[in-house]
């Protein structure tokens, strides 16, 4: 977790931001949290992005002010409004675009002084696995899909009993490309499959790694999935 | 309260321009976009363009060629103009606000102002 | 575009009875579906905005429910004063949609 904190001159207020990222398509969060003052209209909260030259969002007495908003964040952002006087100056962007990553500032003021603080923000593309028994194989085989990966990640596949086992010889990987040119389905066949026995098929790339188990025995079949993004970072 | 209000011609010739003014209150529009929507009679609402907080603009593609939106900040006032007008334009514009600066829901519309494009 | 297709048409229903409205969207627009209220001779009112989320002063028995395509608007016990046009729309991408409506009779 990367935490950044930002203190600035000699009535200074303590500003704090996590690095996050992005899953391009839907909505995402920009965190900042800053020292609460007691007036909402002493407020003002200024989010700025390295390379661009208009605002990305401004709020201030106690309402948002969009005159100086860049054309790229038209429409898409919001602060949480009814949270800005407990110190929550955290960021609501609308259909995440690969464009949307870079370095961004949270800059307040507020009665009692001012701070800012970067924030890190990558976008990609990544969803839970989901790992099945492909019974249309001629052997016993598992099929591992992830409909929204980006960038390209890595896939491999490892098992319970053989731990340290190097499955990259008896398993295929494949990606296609979805329909909005961007992310690629991620799909992945396991041979030669043993029962009694727990797989895990490992998506990761920069920004996630995502995991789908599958304990396959005589009488059932269960499945895990989780999902980690990768560098959370605050400043 | 925030309010809308539309102002318009009711009746265009047709291939003639139409003009409308939303005049709102109760809030900015340099904190809000401002929507236009409209609804041919019997039918269903037709999502026309915006013009957001900044005074860009993004317009429906089947009528970008034809339709402008501006604003006065300080008269609280959008304007909206469509050219070359055609009998099947004749429907009850509408200016509408968000609920919130992310287009989540229109929350605030205005009474509407029917447009006839007839001859 | 993104189409919004709303089912049914039309329906007619009695007061106190449970009304279940559909609203299916051609591509995933994530949870931005927003659902109308028309009355005759009025502009559209908003009920629910974000898919679930009531707007202030609409009535607990209008509920939304839904992402990605498929989208509900529930009535719990329909009144009289529901009958109306209901409309979803969609503001994930331009342009924004809107679908054609459902017309609520009461019998």
């Known amino acids: 977790l990367i935490i950044g904190f930002g203190i600035s001159g000699r009535h200074s207020i303590t500003v704090t931001t996590v690095a996050s990222a992005g899953n391009i398509g839907e909505d995402g969060i920009l965190s900042c949290t800053f020292e609460p003052d007691i007036k909402l209209s002493d407020i003002v909260i200024q989010w700025l992005k390295e390379g661009v030259i208009g605002l990305v969002h401004e709020f201030k007495e106690g309402k948002d002010e969009l005159s100086e908003q860049d054309e790229m964040f038209r429409g898409r952002t919001a602060v949480f409004a009814d949270q800005v006087i407990v110190g929550n100056a955290s960021l609501r962007l609308k259909n995440v675009q690969l464009t949307d990553a870079g370095t961004y500032k949270c800059y307040i003021i507020t009665s009692k002084g001012k701070g800012n603080a970067n924030l890190e923000y990558k976008t990609g593309a990544f969803s839970m696995p989901e790992v099945n028994v492909d019974y249309n194989a001629s052997s016993e085989t598992l099929r591992c899909e992830a409909p929204r990966w980006f960038p390209q990640p890595t896939v491999v596949w490892a098992s319970q009993v053989d731990q340290g086992a190097n499955f990259s010889e008896v398993s295929n990987t494949s990606f296609e490309l979805n329909s909005e040119n961007v992310t690629m389905k991620v799909v992945s066949v396991l041979y030669n499959v043993t029962i009694n026995n727990t797989y895990s098929c490992m998506i990761e790339n920069d920004i996630a790694k995502a995991t789908g188990d599958i304990k396959v025995t005589e009488s059932e079949i269960k499945r895990r999935s989780h999902l980690q993004l990768l560098n959370s970072k605050a400043s | 309260q925030m309010q809308l209000q539309e102002s318009g011609p009711g009746l265009v010739q047709p291939s003639q321009s139409l003009s409308i003014t939303c005049t709102v209150s109760g809030f900015s529009l340099t904190s809000y976009g401002i929507h236009w929507v409209r609804q041919s009679p019997g039918k269903g609402l037709e999502w026309l363009g915006v013009i957001w907080s900044s005074g860009s603009t993004d317009y429906n593609a089947a009528f970008i060629s034809r339709l402008s939106i501006s604003k006065d900040n300080s008269k609280s006032q959008v304007f909206f103009k469509m050219n070359s007008l055609q009998s099947d334009d004749t429907a009850i514009h509408y200016c509408?606000?968000?609920?919130?600066?992310?287009?989540?829901?229109?929350?605030?519309w205005g009474q509407g102002t029917l447009v006839t494009v007839s001859s | 575009n993104i189409v919004m297709t709303q089912s049914p048409k039309s329906m007619s229903m009695s007061v106190g009875e449970r009304v279940t409205l559909s609203c299916k969207a051609s591509?995933?627009?994530?949870?931005?579906v927003s659902w109308y209220q028309q009355k005759p001779e009025q502009s559209p009112k908003l009920l629910i905005y974000?898919?679930?989320n009531r707007y202030t002063g609409v009535p607990d028995r209008f509920t939304g429910s839904g992402s990605a395509t498929d989208f509900t608007l529930t009535i719990s016990s329909v009144q009289a004063e529901d009958l109306a046009d209901y409309h979803c729309?969609?503001?994930?991408?331009?342009?924004?949609?809107f679908g054609s409506g459902t017309k609520l009779e009461i019998k």
């Open positions: 974000g898919a679930s």
């Open positions: 729309g969609q503001s994930y991408s331009y342009p924004f949609t």
């Open positions: 509408a606000r968000d609920i919130t600066t992310i287009a989540e829901g229109f929350a605030y």
């Open positions: 591509e995933n627009v994530g949870t931005y």
